[in-house]
Interface confidence: low
């Protein structure tokens, strides 16, 4: 069986496959995917291996109409080094000479200058060309070699060895070379991969069952760190409470040197956040911490000074923590679309479940905002994921130059953020530089700022606006807002307008529905149309909503109803495959994710139309 | 920040054409709709045309079939040709885009400075 590095390279001109009868004589033959000889992989950047020889594709020179053989795998050969060309065209390094199918008195594979259908190859039973299945490098655990890469294939006991063994050892532990030659350079470290044995590489926190792997031997840079932990299944550690620290800190002690964490603030115009995406609502700074330097976005734990943080330049070579199992937040489920009653009070503006409410004129310290909100039934507003955040910017009313209160604090556990109105944080968004927390400076509760809405730790003293929250009252009339530029029962955002469509309808029938409405099926230009859709439809009982996406007009090719360009695609797991069919969005778990059905399937749809007079808030004078 | 730079405005006859370009450049990562609107002396700014990336269009009821509105993406140029000028298409025009800094932000609103159009005989 073919694993998931391995690929066959099939010409579909002649429909065979490039076939290695031996060394020295490439050719082709009916493709057969369990054939051994038609088997290869990417084994660096630019290296392609026969899996049947362990050896690599190369030529003996770099001149027109040479024969390609196999040779020993030499990273530093400029003769095995290839390259995916635009389309399907796999060519020799820097050079415009091709991997060409030969002739009829030439049978073996061969480099040629032409780049025509003869030179065109594709991965067997895709439509990828060979670079889709490429390298992908496996940093090693514990071992000699600092954490460095696995080099494929390398030779042990005079053997070749094209995948991580447990060849010479007899704990079954698997393990793989970082240089090509292990008999003569003895660097090696274990495999990030499942083997018996492989969990006692991972200690487990009795009290969550959360897993924590120390690599401080190894000397990565952050992103090959995060790497490394990504291939486990794992992610670089994040730290959301308190437990969680203590346990690190007694796991460290041990250790001197710093530590990766996933903490970094490498969006661009973000704050600090978790790579995992946990919520950053823990703060454990070194004093001094976060320095301002400008290139310092990733963060190291530091097991000598108490296992606080600092940050530092992300190409610093460093040791890391890798975490997976059982996340430690709690468990926290949004309201499903049939629990969410609509009705809101007047002014107030109604989102899965609740009602929202922005307080822009009157300001009031923290506190006082806190007991206004909760004397009108509510609370100062928790925002639990970013489609409730994109709904109070986008439909609120809010403004780019607002500083809102929300119900983010720190004003019980310092250093540790809360909502106030009892709720668990599963979601954070901080402004660049955010939270700041400077210690000359009491702030302890956090506002919304900006064009964005994204978050500020403040003094709670000063007197501001604030955004209320409260669960939506299940009797009475739903209110129907007219939005200025849409008709009565569409939705705005940004530039325009949109409607469930309610009836169970085909693709064709949805379609001649909305264009009855001057309208059309949705198109989704980019991930914020589609985290607004993903809010408007992701938490309704129904299973499906179609867009205007098919690949009706050419098999293969989707396209929208409307003549717009395919820029952004969402689709789901397995998804378009190879079925011709119409686009519809999940909700549920899934919610937002594109399936293709069939469609004469019956389901609800989303129709879509320019706003009228479209126009944005006067440009500011400066 | 993003900086929108108009150009190609100036006098014309009634009847006449003009084509405005603007360009977009600094920090963008990623720009969604581009658009012109116009404001007249004493009157409110309103939309005349505008374009997504993907090429869909919308353009004001009052030019319809003599403005056309297009777009280089490559080039973050969005471009406005203005056939059968009236007088009361005088206006100063100002280029509109929403546009994206880095992948994982909200698209906000920019504004070029202005470039005069002056439809009289």
């Known amino acids: 069986l073919l694993d998931t590095r391995q690929f066959l390279i099939y010409n579909e001109d002649h429909k065979r496959c490039v076939d290695a009868v031996s060394p020295s004589a490439v050719q082709t033959a009916a493709c057969n995917q369990d054939a051994e000889s038609q088997k290869f992989r990417w084994v660096s950047e630019s290296q392609i291996m026969s899996v049947a020889f362990k050896l690599c594709l190369g030529v003996p020179s770099k001149t027109d109409w040479v024969a390609i053989t196999l040779y020993a795998c030499d990273s530093k050969s400029e003769f095995q080094k290839w390259e995916c060309k635009n389309d399907t065209l796999l060519g020799i390094k820097g050079e415009d000479l091709f991997f060409n199918y030969g002739n009829r008195q030439e049978k073996n594979i061969m480099l040629y200058k032409g780049s025509g259908l003869w030179s065109r190859w594709k991965i067997y039973g895709t439509t990828d060309n060979l670079c889709s299945r490429g390298y992908e490098a496996m940093y090693t655990l514990l071992g000699n070699a600092n954490g460095a890469t696995c080099a494929f294939p390398f030779k042990f006991e005079n053997k070749w060895y094209a995948d991580c063994t447990s060849a010479g050892r007899s704990d079954g532990w698997l393990w793989c070379g970082t240089t090509t030659d292990y008999d003569t350079d003895k660097l090696f470290g274990y495999c990030p991969l499942k083997f018996e044995g492989s969990e006692s590489l991972w200690n487990k926190d009795p009290l969550t069952s959360v897993s924590y792997q120390i690599n401080s031997k190894s000397a990565l840079t952050w992103h090959q760190a995060r790497k490394s932990c990504q291939q486990q299944n794992a992610e670089l550690l994040s730290i959301t409470e308190i437990h969680e620290q203590t346990y690190l800190t007694g796991l460290t002690s041990s250790l001197t040197s710093g530590l990766w964490i996933g903490l970094n603030s490498l969006s661009f115009n973000s704050g600090w956040q978790w790579s995992d995406r946990s919520p950053f609502r823990y703060l454990n700074w070194l004093p001094g911490s976060p320095s301002a330097e400008p290139g310092k976005s990733c963060v190291s734990l530091n097991p000598g000074k108490n296992a606080k943080w600092e940050n530092l330049e992300c190409v610093q070579k460093l040791g890391y923590i890798c975490k997976k199992g059982n996340t430690t937040l709690n468990s926290f489920v949004i309201p499903s679309e049939s629990d969410v009653p609509t009705h809101c009070p007047s002014q107030w503006w109604p989102y899965a479940g609740h009602c929202y409410k922005i307080h822009r004129d009157e300001k009031k310290i923290q506190r006082d905002a806190l007991t206004t909100c909760r004397k009108e039934g509510g609370d100062l507003t928790s925002i639990h994921t970013i489609e409730e955040l994109d709904f109070i910017i986008s439909q609120l009313g809010y403004e780019p130059n607002d500083e809102l209160w929300i119900g983010l604090n720190d004003i019980k556990i310092q250093m540790y953020f809360e909502w106030s109105d009892g709720t668990p944080v599963t979601f954070t968004k901080w402004l660049r530089g955010e939270p700041s927390h400077e210690n000359n400076r009491q702030e302890d509760c956090v506002v919304m700022k900006g064009k964005d809405g994204y978050w500020a730790d403040r003094g709670c003293e000063w007197p501001l606006g604030y955004i209320c929250k409260m669960k939506s009252r299940s009797q009475g009339p739903e209110i129907v807002e007219v939005e200025k530029g849409c008709r009565k029962g569409w939705k705005k955002h940004h530039f325009y307008c949109y409607m469930i469509g309610h009836t169970l309808s085909t693709f064709a029938e949805a379609n001649q529905t909305c264009n009855n409405e001057n309208a059309y099926l949705t198109t989704i230009e980019d991930r914020y149309e589609q985290a607004f859709l993903t809010s408007f439809v992701g938490l309704r009982p129904e299973k499906y909503f179609w867009t205007g996406l098919s690949d009706i007009q050419t098999k293969g090719t989707f396209q929208w109803t409307i003549e717009e360009e395919v820029r952004f695609t969402h689709w789901n797991s397995d998804m378009p495959g190879r079925k011709p069919g119409c686009v519809a969005m999940r909700t549920g778990i899934a919610g937002g994710l594109w399936d293709v059905l069939k469609c004469d399937e019956k389901a609800k749809f989303v129709c879509k139309h320019w706003a009228e007079g479209v126009t944005h808030p006067p440009k500011p004078t400066t | 920040q993003v900086q929108l730079q108009e150009s190609g405005g100036g006098l014309v006859q009634p009847g006449g054409s003009l084509k405005l370009s603007c360009a977009a450049s600094?920090?963008?990562?990623?720009?969604?709709?581009m658009g012109w609107y116009r404001q007249a002396p004493g009157k409110q700014r309103e939309l005349v045309a505008a374009?997504?990336?993907?090429?869909?269009?919308n353009y004001a009821d009052s030019v319809k079939g003599r403005f056309t509105i297009s777009r280089d993406n490559a080039k973050n140029t969005v471009y406005l040709q203005m056939n059968s000028l009236k007088p009361e298409d005088t206006a100063v025009y100002y280029c509109?885009?929403?546009?994206?800094?880095?992948?994982?932000?909200?698209?906000?609103?920019?504004w070029g400075q202005g470039t005069q159009v002056t439809v009289s005989s």
């Open positions: 509109n885009a929403d546009g994206v800094v880095a992948w994982d932000q909200p698209y906000d609103n920019y």
């Open positions: 600094g920090s963008i990562f990623s720009i969604k709709t």
């Open positions: 374009i997504t990336s993907g090429g869909s269009t």
